[in-house]
């Protein structure tokens, strides 16, 4: 029962995490204009992985895609790649883990096969989560570097007469969504790996030991106990736990994408 719960929970947590990674990747607010000096601004800039946007005080928002591939910074390309790899691995992991779920019967699939699939999906979730965390962290590091560089050059003087204020960017909502989502996917993957250990049939075969009593002899076979636990290779007496099964509506939680106005 504990294994089913761990596996089911791992799947749900990973599902939420991957949904979050997808949402973060699509979001436009990876970096937002720093409003430290001017909390109310007439023009507000924010940028995503795929496009940059400008929201005017008038309420109009204009977004422009990055239509060049070669002209983009290598770091941005790397972040895009990490996020996409994370999504692809996570999606494959979800597909694999659905078939690996203990509460779902698919033909006469062996427990060993389910254990292997659970481990595979777990590893995929871990790598997916790490990709997302790495991608977001690389972008955050890029922002911090640029922030301090633009702070140093905040005011560039035209003979001391004209001030040109440089736009500084700070962490956007997508970074936090990405970090949390990556963390959840990672946790989900670890839970799947833990569940795999419980699913895997024990390989050790104990030899029957005879105990001679005074009147008659009785042979005690540990194999019988093994079957009753539900972890053994004897599947005849095995109980199928479907208490852990949940509807999709209960477990899916897709963070909605907002263009904060």
């Amino acid at each position: 029962m504990a294994v089913t719960a761990c596996q089911g929970l791992g799947f749900v947590v990973s599902l939420i995490g991957i949904a979050g990674i997808i949402a973060a990747t699509c979001m436009d607010q990876w970096s937002t204009q720093d409003l430290y000096n001017n909390p109310v601004t007439a023009v507000f800039n924010y940028q995503g992985l795929w496009r940059s946007c400008v929201r005017e005080s008038s309420g109009f928002t204009e977004c422009r895609g990055y239509f060049t591939l070669l002209g983009l910074p290598a770091m941005l390309q790397a972040v895009r790649a990490l996020m996409i790899v994370g999504i692809v691995l996570g999606a494959i992991g979800l597909l694999v883990s659905i078939f690996a779920l203990k509460c779902i019967r698919i033909g006469s699939m062996e427990d060993s096969a389910k254990a292997n699939m659970t481990l595979t999906s777990g590893i995929m979730f871990i790598v997916s989560g790490l990709c997302a965390i790495a991608g977001v962290s690389v972008f955050a590091n890029m922002l911090v570097t640029n922030f301090w560089m633009s702070t140093a050059n905040m005011y560039t003087g035209m003979g001391g007469m004209v001030q040109t204020v440089q736009t500084r960017y700070t962490f956007g909502a997508a970074l936090f969504v990405g970090w949390v989502a990556g963390g959840l996917t990672l946790i989900g993957g670890v839970m799947m790996c833990i569940a795999c250990r419980g699913l895997a049939p024990e390989e050790t075969n104990y030899k029957a030991v005879s105990y001679h009593a005074s009147g008659h002899s009785v042979a005690y076979k540990p194999g019988g106990f093994k079957a009753s636990t539900g972890f053994g290779s004897n599947t005849k007496n095995k109980k199928i736990y479907d208490g852990g099964a949940r509807t999709e509506d209960e477990v899916q939680s897709y963070p909605s994408k907002h263009d904060y106005v």
């Epitope: 007439a42 940059s52 400008v54 008038s58 309420g59 204009e62 422009r64 004209v162 040109t164 736009t167």
Partner: antibody, heavy 118, light 113 residues
């Protein structure tokens, strides 16, 4: 046809308060921010502040904070500006103006003349 | 606050003449996010409210005659009237739409000789 119809001229005593209205028609009132501008005796223009009719959020020119209060009534598509503690300095023509692309004011009311005199 | 300086304060012209007026801002009005200059030009005739001519420094509002042209970037802007007509006699204001508080220039008065 877009229209911003402002209330008539006002004559007030110093220390009093006044509320100027700006009734809109011909467009979605909540879709555009409403701005208020002051023009003293035919001179230059001064931005007072603006209000987002949808959320009710306001931005004020620091100079007019405490002097002007901007409100809206969505049901009647009307924007209001209240001016308090009036002095002769407040005597001017006040305009309401709709905010458009580039934060420009594309449609203006005809103006309300406020005269503060004892 | 961004200070808008217009010059000259008044211009005396003859019909059909080409006219240029200047507007300078104390800070750049160029937004790095969309590379647009948040500067607007208005025309105000006596007893009337201002009328929008040009926004984003060079985008003409629909219905505005093409003899009105806005140009410039950063801190220096120009409004050009290619051929002045009698109905163009008015006061022209530039406005900073980039940073709060939104500020206006003192205006350039266009008069007929």
């Amino acid at each position: 046809e877009f229209q911003l119809q402002q209330s008539g001229p006002e004559l007030e005593k110093p220390g009093a308060s006044v509320r100027i209205s700006c009734k809109t028609s011909g467009y979605s009132f909540t879709g555009y921010n409403m701005n208020w501008v002051k023009q003293s005796n035919g001179e230059s223009l001064e931005w007072i502040g603006n209000i987002d009719p949808y959320y009710g959020g306001t931005s004020y020119n620091q100079k007019f904070k405490g002097k002007a209060t901007l409100t809206v009534d969505k049901s009647s598509s009307t924007a209001y500006m209240q001016l308090k503690s009036l002095t002769s300095e407040d005597s001017a023509v006040y305009y309401c103006a709709r905010m458009y692309h580039g934060n420009a004011f594309d449609y203006w009311g005809q103006g309300t003349t406020l005269t503060v005199s004892s | 606050d961004i200070v808008m300086t217009q010059s000259p304060s008044s211009l005396t012209v003859t019909a059909g003449e080409k006219v240029t007026m200047s507007c300078k801002s104390s800070q750049s009005l160029l937004n790095s996010g969309n590379l647009k200059n948040y500067l607007t030009w208005y025309q105000q005739k006596p007893g009337q409210p201002p009328k929008l001519l040009i926004y984003w420094a060079s985008t003409r509002k629909s219905g505005v005659p093409d003899r009105f042209t806005g140009s410039g970037s950063g801190t220096d802007f120009t409004l050009t009237l290619s051929s002045v007509q009698a109905e163009d006699l008015a006061v022209y204001y530039c406005q900073n739409d980039y940073s709060y508080p939104l500020t206006f220039g003192a205006g350039t008065k266009l008069e007929l000789k």
